[in-house]
């Protein structure tokens, strides 16, 4: 509540997060032309990245392009990319949608289709849909511990969201345990009115808001956080504005003295921790 | 404009960026003692890194030190580093400019020069100039899509910079399309009065400021972003304070059971997205 | 000091950091069943990560799990994890403390102990103490250069912490050189009343606060930063809330066509640079 007689000061904040959980992933794996069902385990080192600050990322889905090499090859025949003669292909042209630089030649992509040849990491990434259901859909059961240290320098006051009295095996619940700072990812989505299983396919951005409304007067001292959750990406976004949340990264290696890479298009949830509030004192 | 009767509240913001573009890089490549011209393609997975929050990085130049191994070798003969006898070399000494720990011996670096031997990743990194022109100078034509979700919790108001009516093939222009949130990197530099080709050599930091001056009163509601650009690193900085923007990272591998690494000194532009402003309501 | 007649505006800030230093690490290395003392050199590419924004991380300690493969194996016999029969092991169960998914079988871990078999990266990570003293304890002598560009858009005023008159070989000292922006890590800890050697074992979070109290009136203009330091993680934290600061990351590779990884549990100091303050003008 607004106490107009108080001197208000915005919060200075530092956040530390720790994700826990294991996912079992089942997917089709092709080796030597034979496709079979492969099972693998993903732990924190596999699905999250060493990140600083007020964000953490959990990979929930992926598409791999294995064994890419820098060479010439036909580009992927996405909508509008096919050609029938070299006239359609412009030497040196980089289509923003494409993955390489055109050589000017129209070459066979497969039995029925021809596309412009490109200088690129080959074979070029297939523009296939993200797997549905998401490969790491069980990330819904992962938990995140959020540690938040806050400071009102003008009032020379410091505190944190985790108190010595707290129980490390708690799970946040809006009603039963609103001060617990261990959150189940699925619960965060539920609180925000979102469906984890659905968002996990294409990825998204979820905001965890920590609001500190602190009365620092000794006679009515109060300074505890209030947690709330809201989705930050636009689920109704037009294709052209890249809906969801994904990024590409590569693992490079050498095979028979040839530089290769595996390209991973990682879909997932980026959690942004947004800390705000004020400290007021007479 | 300042409406003194309004209750003002600072913006809470979340940012998501997506860079697009391909660069063709031509450089001298030495293999088996033979130097020839090498062409390679860099896509987003090669020149940018999975980053969170209000920053993204685009590599525009690099220097590689390939096949480094942990062993003993002469340090690089930079200014003031040469020696004529062991007296000049102090066992256990770590010169902050050097890349290793001295053994105490003065050894030949090449036909004419001797330097202190160090325990280090060998051969030590040559302190050579960043290539000029920059290897990925064509990054000037890359584009970045910026998605910005903002919230005024006290006014319970949320909006974003991308509206459903927007066209995903637009490009920001201060006059013709000031609400488009797809920016050509070269245009950002031009708007800030900077030369991309020049900055790309040593790297730099560019600020993209998004200013929200929101009037949330229903009778005169206005809440759209205004974009502006300014260079954040000091282009006139003294050598000793490390001008430009670069960092080193390594790719580790094993060859004949020996642990090796390729060290990459990456120069590039870090773009900081600085979101600020207030929401006012009667 | 509060000048009530002034129009105050919060600071908009951008930070760039550069760490310097080399560490010599001595540790027991086991190869082919033989354990011997190994010496290695760590430079910036080995102990820090390309990070954006207002944080940087320096690895001070680590535990490695080498040559892990996805297969079945007994889980690590931590407190309460041992079994005597299959009844104790629940097929498909993922214990948050464990590193894999139980198969339902109770199998030998060693001569005397049995644990539940898991599908995991094997052998599973041993829950051993972080090495003491910390392997990179000499990081105390590393230095960090902090560049801070600030902006008061409403007053159209920009400045930075590094002035042209500054000397690039200075080291910050509260009394003798309070404007130098090159900081020895050990000094930061000393200023904050903390013991670097101790914190380096488990890791921690250290805040570097940069306070700008700017009077922008031309007749009494003053705008220089004031640096202060405080520890941000809770050193008295209960085990269940994960004291210190660490994260796991992996290096993946193929050996004899088998996908393997080395898991590194990296302990270290995350430095958060917290910039705050106001610019006031009549």
């Amino acid at each position: 509540s607004d106490k107009l007689y108080q001197r208000k000061e915005p919060v200075i904040s530092s956040v530390h997060t720790k994700v826990k959980g294991i996912a079992e992933v089942t997917e089709n794996v092709t080796e030597g032309g034979v496709t079979k069902l492969g099972h693998s385990i993903f732990d924190t080192a596999d699905y999250t990245f060493p990140l600083q600050g007020n964000s953490f990322f959990v990979m929930t889905n992926y598409v791999k392009s294995e064994g890419q090499v820098q060479t010439l090859c036909p580009e992927y025949p996405r909508r509008g990319a096919q050609c029938s003669s070299d006239r359609r292909c412009k030497k040196g042209w980089m289509d923003p949608q494409s993955k390489g630089i055109q050589t000017g030649r129209c070459v066979p992509y497969d039995k029925t289709r021809k596309t412009c040849e490109v200088s690129a990491w080959c074979p070029t990434e297939e523009e296939k849909e993200a797997p549905r259901p998401a490969l790491l859909r069980s990330a819904e059961n992962f938990t995140v511990l959020i540690k938040n240290n806050i400071h009102f320098p003008g009032h020379n006051y410091t505190t944190r969201n985790i108190l010595p009295t707290m129980n490390g095996s708690c799970t946040f619940h809006k009603t039963w345990d609103p001060q617990c700072s261990i959150f189940r990812l699925g619960d965060i989505f539920q609180e925000a009115g979102e469906n984890f299983t659905e968002v996990a396919v294409q990825g998204g951005i979820m905001g965890i808001e920590i609001y500190w409304d602190c009365n620092l007067d000794s006679w009515s001292h109060h300074c505890r956080p209030r947690y709330s959750f809201r989705r930050l990406d636009d689920k109704n976004m037009d294709e052209s504005f890249v809906p969801g949340y994904n990024f590409r990264y590569a693992k490079y290696y050498k095979e028979n003295n040839v530089e290769k890479r595996t390209l991973i298009k990682a879909f997932g949830i980026r959690f942004d921790i947004l800390v705000f509030g004020t400290g007021g004192k007479f | 404009s300042d409406k003194l009767y309004q209750r003002k509240e600072p913006v809470i913001s979340s940012v998501h960026t997506k860079v697009k573009g391909i660069a063709e890089v031509t450089e001298n490549v030495t293999e088996g003692g033979v130097t020839k011209l090498g062409h390679s393609i860099f896509d987003t997975a090669d020149y940018t890194f999975p980053l969170q929050g209000n920053s993204f990085f685009v590599m525009t130049n690099y220097v590689k030190s390939e096949g480094q191994v942990q062993t003993l070798c002469p340090e690089y003969p930079r200014r003031g580093a040469q020696c004529s006898s062991d007296r000049r070399c102090k066992k256990g000494w770590m010169d902050p400019q050097s890349k290793g720990i001295q053994t105490g011996r003065c050894v030949p670096y090449d036909k004419t020069r001797k330097t202190c031997e160090v325990s280090a990743w060998c051969p030590t990194e040559e302190e050579k100039e960043a290539p000029r022109p920059a290897l990925l100078r064509s990054a000037e034509n890359f584009t970045v899509l910026i998605k910005n979700n903002i919230h005024f919790p006290g006014h319970n108001y949320t909006t974003r910079n991308i509206l459903p009516t927007m066209n995903g093939s637009c490009t920001f222009h201060k006059t013709w399309d000031p609400q488009c949130s797809i920016f050509r990197l070269g245009d950002i530099f031009q708007e800030a009065g900077e030369n991309f080709t020049e900055v790309a050599v040593q790297g730099g930091i560019m600020g993209i400021e998004i200013y929200w001056d929101c009037n949330l009163d229903s009778w005169s509601h206005h809440c759209r972003p205004r974009y502006s650009f300014r260079r954040l690193d000091d282009k006139n900085m003294d050598e000793s304070f490390v001008p430009g923007y670069n960092f080193r990272y390594a790719k580790y591998y094993k060859e004949n059971n020996v642990e090796k690494r390729t060290l990459i000194k990456a120069f590039g532009i870090r773009f900081d997205i600085l979101v600020f402003g207030t929401g006012g309501k009667f | 000091s509060d000048k009530l007649y002034q129009r105050k505006e919060p600071v908009i800030s951008s930070v760039h950091t550069k760490v310097k230093g080399i560490a010599e690490v001595t540790e027991n290395v086991t190869e082919g069943g033989v354990t011997k003392l190994g010496h290695s050199i760590f430079d910036t590419a080995d102990y820090t990560f390309p990070l954006q924004g207002n944080s940087f991380f320096v690895m001070t300690n680590y535990v490695k799990s080498e040559g892990q493969v996805q297969t079945l194996c007994p889980e690590y016999p931590r407190r309460g994890a041992q079994c005597s029969s299959d009844r104790r092991c629940k097929k498909g169960w993922m214990d948050p403390q464990s590193k894999g998914i139980q198969t339902g079988r109770c199998v030998p871990y060693d001569k005397t102990r049995k644990t539940c078999e898991v599908s995991a990266w094997c052998p599973t990570e041993e829950e051993k103490e972080a090495p003491r003293p910390a392997l990179l304890r000499s990081a105390e002598n590393f230095t960090v250069l902090i560049k801070n560009n600030i902006h008061f858009p409403g007053h159209n005023y920009t400045t930075r912490n590094i002035l042209p008159t500054m000397n690039g070989s200075c080291t910050f000292h509260k009394t003798w050189d309070p404007q130098c922006s090159i900081f020895r890590l050990g000094d930061i800890f000393q200023e904050a009343g903390e013991n670097f050697t101790e914190v380096a074992v488990q890791g921690g979070i250290m805040g570097i606060e940069i306070y700008w109290d700017c009077n922008l009136d031309s007749w009494s203009h003053h705008c220089r930063p004031r640096y202060s330091f405080r520890r941000l993680d809770d050193k008295n934290m209960d085990e269940s809330f994960v004291p210190g600061y660490n994260f796991r990351y992996a290096k993946y590779y193929k050996e004899n066509n088998v996908e393997k990884r080395t898991l590194i549990k990296a302990f270290g100091i995350r430095f958060d640079i917290l910039v705050f303050g106001t610019g006031g003008k009549f």
Partner: nanobody, 115 residues
Framework: EVQLVESRGGLVQAGGSLRLSCAAS?????MGWFRQAPGKEREFVAG????????RYADSVKSRFTISRDNAKNTVSLQMSGLKPEDTAIYYC???????????WGQGTQVTVSS
């Protein structure tokens, strides 16, 4: 430290069969076999987890060699059939923490396949 004792190897005609066995001084999760041919590095042959789950074979011996173990006796055996001259090597029994990871090796036993 685990002690391992392998059975005697022998000389076999190409196309013939041979069975190797090995006893461990204590129970371990995995037991397996490696081999080293003259002038070559030691290579993995076959491995078995607890109760024979899982099993793993080198590509070169798949469908010709079979590994089996007896948990109660802490033993493992390798049934080799369709032997080829290139199978000639010293065969080592090993124990470890998974079918990919081995810490202790026996003294080795010579197997020679003549053409």
């Amino acid at each position: 430290e685990v002690q391992l004792v392998e059975s005697r190897g022998g000389l076999v005609q190409a196309g013939g069969s041979l069975r190797l066995s090995c006893a461990a001084s204590e129970r371990t999760y995995s037991m397996g076999w490696f081999r080293q041919a003259p002038g070559k590095e030691r290579e993995f042959v076959a491995g078995s987890g607890w109760d024979g789950i899982p099993t793993r074979y080198a590509d070169s011996v798949k469908s010709r060699f079979t590994i089996s173990r007896d948990n109660a006796k802490n033993t493992v055996s390798l049934q080799m059939s369709g032997l080829k001259p290139e199978d000639t090597a010293i065969y080592y029994c090993a124990t470890g923490t998974s079918v990919y990871h081995y810490q202790y090796w026996g003294q080795g036993t010579q197997v020679t396949v003549s053409s």
